[in-house]
């Protein structure tokens, strides 16, 4: 992040930006920036694979939930959206697109129906769903 | 906003930031930044007046809805939260804290009970509620 104060002195702006204020990002244009992560909610319903491809085409991935503190904005998300969590039938675990395992106590996993993909819903709930079912989705980009 | 590309060349960073990426803000620390507006959701339930005071103490105001396009992140907000919309009994209009009148077709106004304050709920709905009822609230800061 570029401290707003640093930028302010650097460019000798007239507007004084309080020390507590800062810039967030960088993020793709018109994405949500929160605690230096970038999020975008996509209205168009796609299956999990298409959703993943859409995020990848924007240099992002499907939502990864890694911290209730850093991602507390997710508490208030309405509806159900594909996230990057998939079931590995060989060992029965749930893992993210990057291969990391779902940390315990991060998500409450609820079985909607038999499936290997998961939808994110408010208050850190993950709903197991058939990967081929079209749903809206959340892309995420972690800043450098 | 500081274009990420501009910052990148200025500081001669090694990481290449795509032209389509940009910084958002400035915002108070740990607030949500979206389309250069800053938002924060407060969990603690307060009446409308206390909510307003809380936002003001953070150099912000209660949520003002002014554009469905610029504020489309509000579509997916779960639950009910105080916003800066109040009823003016003398002329029967609804206006924001800054004195501006609620634009037509921005919010669907629904009466919960008799009241002069309004709660924001998903999909651009405003619920009329008694100002003394404690609720969570949304603060907003528009960037310079």
């Amino acid at each position: 992040i570029w401290s707003a104060v640093f930028l302010n002195s650097l460019f000798n702006q007239e507007v004084q930006i309080p020390l507590t204020e800062s810039y967030c990002g960088p993020c793709p244009k018109n994405w949500i920036c929160y605690k230096n992560n970038c999020y975008q909610f996509f209205n168009e319903s796609k299956n999990w694979y298409e959703s993943q491809a859409s995020c990848m085409s924007q240099n992002a991935s499907l939502l990864k939930v890694y911290s209730k503190e850093d991602q507390d904005l997710l508490k208030l998300v309405k509806s159900y959206h594909w996230m990057g969590l998939v079931h590995i039938p060989t060992n029965g675990s749930w893992q993210w697109e990057d291969g990391s395992i779902l940390s315990p106590n991060l998500l409450t996993i609820i079985e909607m129906q038999k499936g290997d993909c998961a939808l994110y819903a408010s208050s850190f709930k993950g709903y197991i769903e058939n990967c081929s079912i079209p749903n809206t989705y959340i892309c995420m980009q972690r800043t450098v | 906003i500081w274009s990420a590309v501009f910052l990148n060349s200025l500081f001669n960073q090694e990481v290449q930031i795509p032209l389509t990426e940009s910084y958002c803000g400035p915002c108070p620390k740990n607030w949500i930044c979206y389309k250069n507006n800053c938002y924060q959701f407060f969990n603690e339930s307060k009446n409308w007046y206390e909510s307003q005071a809380s936002c003001m103490s953070q150099n912000a105001s209660l949520l003002k809805v002014y554009s469905k396009e610029d504020q489309d992140l509000l579509k997916l907000v779960k639950s009910y939260h105080w916003m800066g919309l109040v009823h003016i009994p003398t002329n029967g209009s609804w206006q924001w804290e800054d004195g501006s009148i609620l634009s037509p077709n921005l919010l669907t106004i629904i009466e919960m009970q008799k009241g002069d304050c309004a709660l924001y709920a998903s999909s651009f709905k405003g619920y009329i509620e008694n100002c003394s009822i404690p609720n969570t609230y949304i603060c907003m800061q528009r960037t310079v």
Epitope: - | S79, Y80, T108, I110, M112, A121, K125, Y127, I133, N135
Partner: antibody, heavy 124, light 108 residues
């Protein structure tokens, strides 16, 4: 004037079906949850079903679950109660009511507008 | 399931009397309690909601109070048009509504 008008009641044999309608006027129908409440002859009020403002959530009393279906058509400002597998104990006056229940909200503000009721008699 | 009981089930009173009806819940509930008035052959009418808030247009002689498991509806000075049956109603945590058995208020 805010009004609810029920119709569709009548005499039906046990095991039969009936569809009640409730037409709303004078308020924004699509913005409110709607309930059905019934009252058996000489008895008290019994809540039957609620449908949320969006129509996405429906709730039923245990006594009617699996037999009754509550639905709404916002374009017609109309609420419906489809009643199947009717029993003698379903005999009652059925009221529809505008319900100030808001999904996920901490307070409940009651059923503030009621229809005049329609009588359903289940008898052979 | 939370049960509601009302007492008395029948009440005989004079015009001008102060009348109190009690509604008890089988376990503690929030303030999501409402009171309705019903006259013979008519639909119920909402009087009080959220335990103590008077519905618009309802005379101020009606009032509601209570918390936890015990709630009351009071009519400070009974009028001829107040003779009716009164029901309390409670909303459980998910939308399932329970009505009390009713209290019939009659002219003495």
């Amino acid at each position: 004037e805010v009004q609810l008008l029920e119709s569709g009641g009548g005499l039906v044999q046990p095991g039969g079906s009936l569809r009640l309608s409730c037409t709303a006027s004078g308020f924004t129908f699509s913005s409110y949850a709607m309930s059905w409440v019934r009252q058996a002859p000489g008895k008290g009020l019994e809540w039957v079903s609620l449908i949320s403002e969006s129509g996405s959530s429906t709730y039923y009393a245990d006594s009617v679950k699996g037999r009754f279906t509550n639905s709404r058509d916002d374009s017609r400002n109309t609420l419906y109660l489809q009643m199947n597998s009717l029993r003698a104990e379903d005999t009652a006056v059925y009221y529809c009511a505008k319900d100030r229940w808001f999904e996920g909200y901490h307070s409940y503000y009651g059923m503030d507008v009621w229809g005049q009721g329609t009588t359903v008699t289940v008898s052979s | 399931d939370i049960q509601l009981t009302q007492s008395p089930s029948f009440l005989s009173a004079f015009v001008g009397d102060r009348v109190t009806i009690t509604c008890r819940a089988s376990q503690g509930i929030s303030n999501n309690l409402a009171w309705y008035q019903q006259k013979p052959g008519k639909a119920p009418k909402l009087l009080v909601y959220a335990t103590s808030t008077l519905q618009s247009g309802v005379p101020s002689r009606f009032s509601g109070s209570g918390s936890g498991t015990e709630f009351t509806l009071t009519v400070s000075s009974l009028q001829p048009e107040d003779f009716a049956t009164y029901y309390c109603q409670q909303l459980k945590s998910y939308p399932s509504f329970t009505f009390g058995p009713g209290t019939k208020v009659d002219i003495k």
